[in-house]
Interface confidence: medium
C-alpha cells in the first residue's frame, strides 16, 4: 500500500491501489479522499486539490463512503399497509416493512415494495403453514375428526371433543355437541398440531350442556365428517 505519509491527492504507483477511504480519480489520475456516509462530493479532486465534500440535503442520503456528485433520494413515504422501521436520515434510507397481518409480496434490497394481507382460512379450513414476513398463510381442509369454526390467518384445525353421548356430530367447521356433562378432548387421528401462533382470538369453548337424563352407556359416533364440498381454501 502507498506510504502512509502521502497526503491526498497523490499519484499512486502504476497499477497500485489507493488507501482505505480513498479512491482513484480517473480524470485527475490521483488518489483522492472519499466522502463519508451522510456526505457527497461537492467538488471533485484535481491534481492539486482534494475532494470537497458536503452534507446531504434533506430527504437524501449516502450510506457508504463515496464520491457521488449527489446524494441518493430517500424512498417515498411508507404506504398505509406498512410501518416505517427506519427513518430517512443523511446516512440511511427509509425502510418500510409490512404491518401485522400483512406479508411482503414484493421485497426490495431493504424493506418491502408491496405488502399484501395474510390469507384467512375460512371455517372448515385451518392453517397448514403460518404466514411469515415474506410468505402468505397456507390453508388446508380440516381432516376427519378435526374442525375450525373461525375465519382466521392463525387458527389451526382442532380435534372434536369426544362425548359420552353425542347430541350433534362434529364436522369440518363445527365441534361435536355433547349431551353428557363431562366431554373430553380427543387427540383425533389425522389432527395436525402446529405450534399455536400468538393470536388475539378467544379460545373456542363449548357451553356446558344441561345434565343428561339418558342412561350412562358410553358410545362414540363416527367422527369423520364428509369433506367440504368447496375445494378452495378461501381468502
Amino acid at each position: 500500500l502507498p506510504a502512509q505519509v502521502a497526503f491526498t491527492p497523490y499519484a499512486p504507483e502504476p497499477g497500485s491501489t489507493c488507501r482505505l477511504r480513498e479512491y482513484y480519480d480517473q480524470t485527475a489520475q490521483m488518489c483522492c479522499s472519499k466522502c463519508s456516509p451522510g456526505q457527497h462530493a461537492k467538488v471533485f479532486c484535481t491534481k492539486t486539490s482534494d475532494t470537497v465534500c458536503d452534507s446531504c440535503e434533506d430527504s437524501t442520503y449516502t450510506q457508504l463512503w463515496n464520491w457521488v456528485p449527489e446524494c441518493l433520494s430517500c424512498g417515498s413515504r411508507c404506504s398505509s399497509d406498512q410501518v416505517e422501521t427506519q427513518a430517512c436520515t443523511r446516512e440511511q434510507n427509509r425502510i418500510c416493512t409490512c404491518r401485522p397481518g400483512w406479508y411482503c409480496a414484493l421485497s426490495k434490497q431493504e424493506g418491502c415494495r408491496l405488502c399484501a394481507p395474510l390469507r384467512k382460512c375460512r371455517p372448515g379450513f385451518g392453517v397448514a403453514r403460518p404466514g411469515t414476513e415474506t410468505s402468505d398463510v397456507v390453508c388446508k381442509p380440516c381432516a376427519p375428526g378435526t374442525f375450525s369454526n373461525t375465519t382466521s390467518s392463525t387458527d389451526i384445525c382442532r380435534p372434536h371433543q369426544i362425548c359420552n353421548v353425542v347430541a350433534i356430530p362434529g364436522n369440518a367447521s363445527m365441534d361435536a355437541v355433547c349431551t353428557s356433562t363431562s366431554p373430553t378432548r380427543s387427540m383425533a387421528p389425522g389432527a395436525v398440531h402446529l405450534p399455536q401462533p400468538v393470536s388475539t382470538r378467544s379460545q373456542h369453548t363449548q357451553p356446558t350442556p344441561e345434565p343428561s337424563t339418558a342412561p350412562s352407556t358410553s358410545f362414540l359416533l363416527p367422527m369423520g365428517p364428509s369433506p367440504p364440498a368447496e375445494g378452495s381454501t378461501g381468502d
Epitope: G15, S16, R21, Y23, L64, N66, V68, P69
Partner: nanobody
C-alpha cells in the same frame, strides 16, 4: 447494486492458516480496487491488502509475507490466504470494492477470524 459476502472465517490456532473468500453477486471486472480490511474491537479499521483491476497486490507491513490477496474476475470472487496467523490478527475481516460506475465503496458484512490457542 452488487452485494459482497465473505466466508471462511473461524477459530484457528497461532501459526495456522485460513482462507477468506468474498463472493460478489455480480461482475467485479469493473471494480478498479478490491481489498480486505479488518477491525478489532475498539480499534480503527485497518487496510490489510488490496488488489487493482490489473491484478497488482499491495499489503500492509503487518501482513507482508504471510497474507496473499487474489481475485478472479471470471468467478466474481476475491480471496485472502492467511498463513502464520498471530493472535493480533484476530478481528472481523471485511472485503470491499470501489464501484466506479456507482461512485461508492461497497463492503460485505464481515467474517470473524479468531486466532487463539
Amino acid at each position: 447494486q452488487v452485494q459482497l459476502v465473505e466466508s471462511g472465517g473461524g477459530l484457528v490456532q497461532p501459526g495456522g492458516s485460513l482462507r477468506l473468500s468474498c463472493a460478489a453477486s455480480g461482475s467485479i471486472s469493473d471494480f478498479y480496487a478490491m481489498g480486505w480490511y479488518r477491525q478489532a474491537p475498539g480499534n480503527q479499521r485497518e487496510l490489510v491488502a488490496a488488489i487493482s483491476s490489473s491484478g497488482k497486490p499491495n499489503y500492509a507491513d503487518s501482513v507482508k509475507g504471510r497474507f496473499t490477496i487474489s481475485r478472479d474476475n471470471a468467478k466474481n470472487t476475491l480471496w485472502l490466504q492467511m498463513n502464520s496467523l498471530k493472535p493480533e490478527d484476530t478481528a472481523v475481516y471485511y472485503c470491499y470494492a470501489d464501484d466506479y460506475s456507482a461512485g461508492f465503496e461497497l463492503r460485505g458484512q464481515g467474517a470473524l477470524v479468531t486466532v487463539s490457542s
